[in-house]
Interface confidence: low
Amino acid sequence: KLTIESTPFNVAEGKEVLLLVHNLPQHLFGYSWYKGERVDGNRQIIGYVIGTQQATPGPAYSGREIIYPNASLLIQNIIQNDTGFYTLHVIKSDLVNEEATGQFRVYPELPKPSISSNNSKPVEDKDAVAFTCEPETQDATYLWWVNNQSLPVSPRLQLSNGNRTLTLFNVTRNDTASYKCETQNPVSARRSDSVILNVLYGPDAPTISPLNTSYRSGENLNLSCHAASNPPAQYSWFVNGTFQQSTQELFIPNITVNNSGSYTCQAHNSDTGLNRTTVTTITVYAEPPKPFITSNNSNPVEDEDAVALTCEPEIQNTTYLWWVNNQSLPVSPRLQLSNDNRTLTLLSVTRNDVGPYECGIQNELSVDHSDPVILNVLYGPDDPTISPSYTYYRPGVNLSLSCHAASNPPAQYSWLIDGNIQQHTQELFISNITEKNSGLYTCQANNSASGHSRTTVKTITVSAELPKPSISSNNSKPVEDKDAVAFTCEPEAQNTTYLWWVNGQSLPVSPRLQLSNGNRTLTLFNVTRNDARAYVCGIQNSVSANRSDPVTLDVLYGPDTPIISPPDSSYLSGANLNLSCHSASNPSPQYSWRINGIPQQHTQVLFIAKITPNNNGTYACFVSNLATGRNNSIVKSITVSASGTSPGLSAGA
């Protein structure tokens, strides 16, 4: 079928359009183009005869049309009037006619639009602004852009006049933006330049900074005021209602208590005619005095006295702080603070409470600290210690004993031998001792301030012969694979060699055996049951030698995994079941039985007479050692068959 295609369909003024023919029949006589939807001789544009290849213009020919041999029509330099329908009339060789109609539309090229406004300086929350896109153009579509985005949905935005006018009702400062309009038709689109909306607003309630309201006497006061405003606000300062200056900042150097009061900032916008004010109350404080600590007892006695420390001076509405040993107060039932924190009471002082103590007064801008105070706690004397620790000496050597007892003030010392006073010194020295110097040596320590005395007595033996030694132990019943045992050979004697034997043999080499303290102490680490042997220590010097009685180590161990005997697991019905359980353990373990999980008796032997198949099941023996706190168990399955059903079964016990 014969058809006409317009390329393009929408044509801009001044451009060209091609009316392209499709499915043109063969064997043609000629064809003719007409303006309009029908063949009308008065509106013929051009005709074409194939045989002569001659084109003949018609009444509607404008001189801008070109016809091609394929019947297509090109129209150049399009004008608005060219819009509409075009009809092709084809005359075939058999003189049968065929017609086809095509069309196109002509649009003008749009000019660059511009925006006009009815209000160049609208006031926030008061005015409306109407933007209009110029010029008014037929068959054009109008679009609007805000900050290069399409219009937001808002009840304050309204389009009218075929979208040519954009109205912003009740403008706000947020409407300050770049506005553009765009015109479009099928052949062109143009955008205007930006128009920036200048919304007048404010001033808002001003902000005074910094926010602090408390100052110390002698400081500088520097306040700054700011209020959001367009155009920028003009500022004025008032102190206690009296005008000061018209500046954004207020500076007062070296303030005093007299500068306390209400400070008002006023912001004014000359365009909107609005004023807003903010008031801040400034308080100027005088410097507080440096605190100091007083005590109700400068020399308290340990475990007897209480001490009350008070932070001076007393100031109303002040926070008092305390520190001990440069730390904040520890939680202790012996430390009590008064309701106002000014008094710290130490109940029943100890020697560790000496301090130092500090108190602080919290003023508005800082913490002022007292000088540290140290308590002189009177204590002691504790039980005196006599050194060295030797108790056996050989004749002819010098005896030099020293005594010390913790005490404040330092203790005064006295020595007694067999109850007789010797001298008032901390050290006792006797040269070239003999057997006659053997006896009870007593050190007495006395605290003159508290009036307390303590004594320690030491037995000194002077002898050429060494005494029979003995073995002391730090653990008489160690647990296997857990405990260590330290044996010590007593007594400690000067110039003496210490030796050890285990089961009559010298010590074996073992990483678990360690000698220390001049071989006087033998330590066994991680004891095992094999360490349960006889231990002997010996002492010797150039004159004599002696051995201790043996000490046998009692190692607690087990219980090991028990064994149930006899080992048989199959029995004949009617036989007696007699099971015995045994586990290696020290001390002997406690035994208990369970059959199929049900507790039975607490015996080492389980006896059941004349068993039947009902006695089938699991027999568990449980062992526990209360000394080691350990447990163990074993399970055995027993099968009882009816008499004569299975060869080789045990007849039982």
Epitope: N212, S214, T319, S328, S366
Partner: nanobody, 119 residues
Framework: EVQLVESGGGLVQPGGSLRLSCAAS????????IGWVRRAPGKEEELVAA????????RYADSVKGRFTISADTSKNTAYLQMNSLRAEDTAVYYC????????????WGQGTTVTVSS
Amino acid sequence: EVQLVESGGGLVQPGGSLRLSCAASGFNIKDTCIGWVRRAPGKEEELVAAICPYKGYTRYADSVKGRFTISADTSKNTAYLQMNSLRAEDTAVYYCANVAYSGGHYNYWGQGTTVTVSS
């Protein structure tokens, strides 16, 4: 000139952590007490934590006890607020302020740092 400058705020999920810093200049923080005060729309201003750096004296609001830790580095003249197990109700502008340890008076303030706790 006295200045307090906060940093470290931001957006964090519930249960998360943030560490706020408060750098002081113009005075010595070991001679005073520093606090963190928060302001949220529709809520009362709250002093959440305070420290007297001289001896590490600290106090906390019940709402943050066990979750927030206040500390100070006197060598850097800086106070910190470590905020753990953050909740939506911790969303606020956090100000560092020179405060009385017992609360009540806030003197020098920083400009604030915003903490938003949201999933």
